[in-house]
């Protein structure tokens, strides 16, 4: 389906405020340290050129391709070579080189101060003075910040903060009506940062076939009374919808997405019951609510696999007729029957299958050799679910906080290499799990722990790939994307690390420590823990309690003294040298 | 298991069409591959057309662009929409499935079959 003018086409299937808000998306996306007003022009004059083109496809430029105008387009920034550095070097490139380039620059933990939240009366001026550039402004920081946050998502996000101040700059009280809202978005709009880094990440590293096996498995749970030719047909479809946005196609991916919510919802009775009511709404909540529609209920009466995966004839011609059909179809009918399944393990499953026949169809006696193979499943099932069970129980028995830390030591342990910030980081993360995922009933406690897990690792390895300093961190992000937590579940404590010299200075507290919010406390006591771990990494769980609650005992000492700082001044090497004596 | 019963035969003037459909029932046989076969009187069996998992056909030469199979997964059905019908397409047809990617051409390789329907063609 080609088109005169893409610019063109574009525009006029997405409409001028989408077409707008993509474009900022995908510029701040690239140019991450550009100002907020450079970005405004920039977009402005691609919107205005795009109106040429649509008034006259023919026009001057309105045959270049996306990539070619866009990345022109960027290439006009005067401070390229000062801000940037070798990222300008894209610029002496030609199309596809030049936009694999900008994407490969592209900064998962970039040097950016965390955004402040203003007082509401202030936000709520700026809204109401100027909307459009208080929306736009939302959507640079949230895109410049998360490089690979899913675009056409970002605008539903976006279409959510403005009705939150629609309705709330007008309430009695506003800050009680827009605070919760604004800390849901922001929390919300993480995990579907992180959600989406896994899918980009899926892509990127382990290829389409990665991500077409994780989507058949998880459309097939979502969907599980569709055929399975409706399941690869939606997982073609949503695999160029990633593929386009994680390559910074965003006009396509969103026009595409799109296309695929008019699909579903034109094809709902041979798809799922459940997409109804996603249905009626517009398109951005259109597309969010499908995304994350509920799995519709199993059809009764699934017959056992066996019969076609392991007792049938032609369990091995269909395998070498077509290897990955089979495989998927296996997929499919493992995951519509196992909603109660992560979808790593579904993968890991679906891998023994392949493993098992790659060397049986080989073998004398092939039906001899596969007979067994499903139960081969169960140590690769019980693994997960013995793992959610231990890690719940220790999360009820400790609390979000402490579960937290006996993860931040465990981790530290693991990886001691691993960047202080980033361990942190990572383990507060996983120690999240314990609260979003322990609650819930058993058939839905590993899909959602494990799964989770899978999303902040790979945050892990994404940030490690940009500073790489351990070989176990490597091998577990770049050997298996299925495997990653078990790799990661299985490492021990780093014997060949050698513990990092005490430094007085990352134990020395402040009377600011005093002024901190709750969470902002925690991350300093938990900073200081990975240190300890860092410099006594063989200190037992009873020794590192010690400290620690000897930590917080300090901490609100000198937080209720008349002089704090003079408290802390003093105390400090007190609790530093009688925490050295407990680790002696 | 699987067991297939055919419908839709019957007598029919040259030129004229009818309709077979095959009802599957025991497990949804979407995945599977479906066939349909011919015998008349006094010959083998022979291949008509065939029908996977996507919905991708084969035909037989003598009856390509007369005859379409096609399949409905939500009744679990398979058909054989038979147009400009001959004399010599007088024969039972039957019904048959088998759990394969790639569909067969060879009644050997089905694993279940229909009891056949009748069709005559009369000039």
């Known amino acids: 389906d080609t088109h005169k003018s893409e610019v063109a086409h574009r525009f006029k299937d997405l409409g001028e405020e989408h077409f707008k808000g993509l474009v900022l998306v995908a510029f701040s996306q690239y140019l991450q340290q550009c100002p907020f007003e450079e970005h405004v022009k920039l977009v402005n004059e691609v919107t205005e050129f795009a109106k040429t083109c649509v008034a006259d496809e023919s026009a001057e430029n309105c045959d270049k391709s996306l990539h070619t105008l866009f990345g022109d387009k960027l290439c006009t920034v005067a401070t390229l070579r000062e801000t940037y550095g070798e990222m300008a070097d894209c610029c002496a490139k030609q199309e596809p080189e030049r936009n694999e380039c900008f994407l490969q620059h592209k900064d998962d933990n970039p040097n950016l101060p965390p955004l402040v939240r203003p007082e509401v009366d202030v936000m709520c001026t700026a809204f109401h003075d100027n909307e459009a550039t208080f929306l736009k402004k939302y959507l640079y920081e949230v895109a410049r910040r998360h490089p690979y946050f899913y675009a056409p998502e970002l605008l539903f996000f976006a279409a959510r903060y403005k009705a939150a101040f629609a309705e709330c700059c007008q309430a009695a009280d506003k800050a009680a009506c827009l605070l919760p809202k604004l800390d849901e978005l922001r929390d919300e709009g993480k995990a579907s940062s992180a959600k989406q880094r896994l899918k980009c990440a899926s892509l990127q590293k382990f290829g389409d076939r990665a991500f077409k096996a994780w989507a058949v498995a998880r459309l097939s749970q979502k969907f599980p009374k569709a055929e399975f030719a409706e399941v690869s047909k939606l997982v073609t479809d949503l695999t160029k919808v990633h593929t386009e946005c994680c390559h910074g196609d965003l006009l396509e991916c969103a026009d595409d997405r799109a296309d695929l919510a008019k699909y579903m919802c034109e094809n709902q009775d041979s798809i799922s019951s459940k997409l109804k009511e996603c249905c009626d709404k517009p398109l951005l909540e259109k597309s969010h609510c499908l995304a994350e529609v509920e799995n519709d209920e199993m059809p009764a009466d699934l017959p056992s696999l066996a019969a076609d995966y392991v007792e049938s004839k032609d369990v091995c011609k269909n395998y070498a007729e077509a290897k990955d059909v089979f495989l998927g179809m296996f997929l499919y009918e493992y995951a519509r029957r196992h909603p109660d399944y992560s979808v790593m393990l579904l993968l890991r499953l679906a891998k023994a299958y392949e493993a098992t026949l790659e060397k049986c169809c080989a073998a004398a006696d092939p039906h001899e050799c596969y007979a067994k193979v499903f139960d081969e499943f169960q140590p690769l099932v019980e693994e997960p679910q013995n793992l959610v069970k231990q890690n719940c129980e220790l999360f009820e028995q400790l609390g979000e906080y402490k579960f937290q830390n006996a993860l931040l030591v465990r981790y530290t342990k693991k990886v001691p290499q691993v960047s202080t910030p980033t361990l942190v980081e990572v383990s507060r993360n996983l120690g999240k799990v314990g609260a979003k995922c322990c609650k819930l009933p058993e058939a839905k406690r590993m899909p959602c722990a494990e799964d989770y897990l899978s999303v902040v690792l790979n945050r892990l390895c994404v940030l490690h790939e940009k500073t790489p300093v351990s070989e176990k961190v490597t091998k577990c992000c770049t050997e298996s994307l299925v495997n990653r937590r078990p790799c990661f579940s299985a490492l021990e404590l780093d014997e060949a690390y050698v513990p990092k010299a005490f430094n007085a200075e990352t134990f020395t507290f402040h009377a600011d420590m005093c002024t901190l919010s709750e969470k902002e406390k925690q991350v300093k006591k938990q900073t200081a823990l990975v240190e300890l771990v860092k410099h006594k990494p063989k200190a037992t769980k009873e020794q590192l309690k010690g400290v620690m609650d000897n930590f917080a005992a300090f901490v609100e000492k000198c937080c209720k003294a008349d002089d704090k700082e003079a408290c802390f001044a003093e105390e400090g090497p007190k609790f530093v040298a009688a925490s050295q004596a407990a680790l002696a | 298991q699987v067991q297939l019963n055919e419908s839709g035969g019957g007598m029919v003037q040259a030129g004229g069409s009818l309709r077979l459909s095959c009802a599957a029932s025991?497990?949804?046989?979407?995945?599977?591959?479906a066939g349909w076969f011919r015998q008349a009187p006094g010959k083998e069996r022979e291949f008509v057309a065939a029908?996977?998992?996507?919905?991708?056909?084969t035909y037989a030469d003598s009856v390509k662009g007369r005859f379409i199979i096609s399949r409905e997964y939500a009744k679990n059905t398979v058909a054989l929409q038979m147009n400009s019908l001959k004399p010599e397409d007088t024969a039972v047809y039957y019904c048959a499935a088998v759990f394969r990617i790639v569909a067969p051409k060879t009644q050997y390789e089905y694993d279940y079959w229909g009891q056949g329907t009748q069709v005559t063609v009369s000039s």
């Open positions: 029908i996977n998992w996507n919905k991708t056909t």
């Open positions: 025991g497990r949804t046989v979407s995945n599977y591959a």
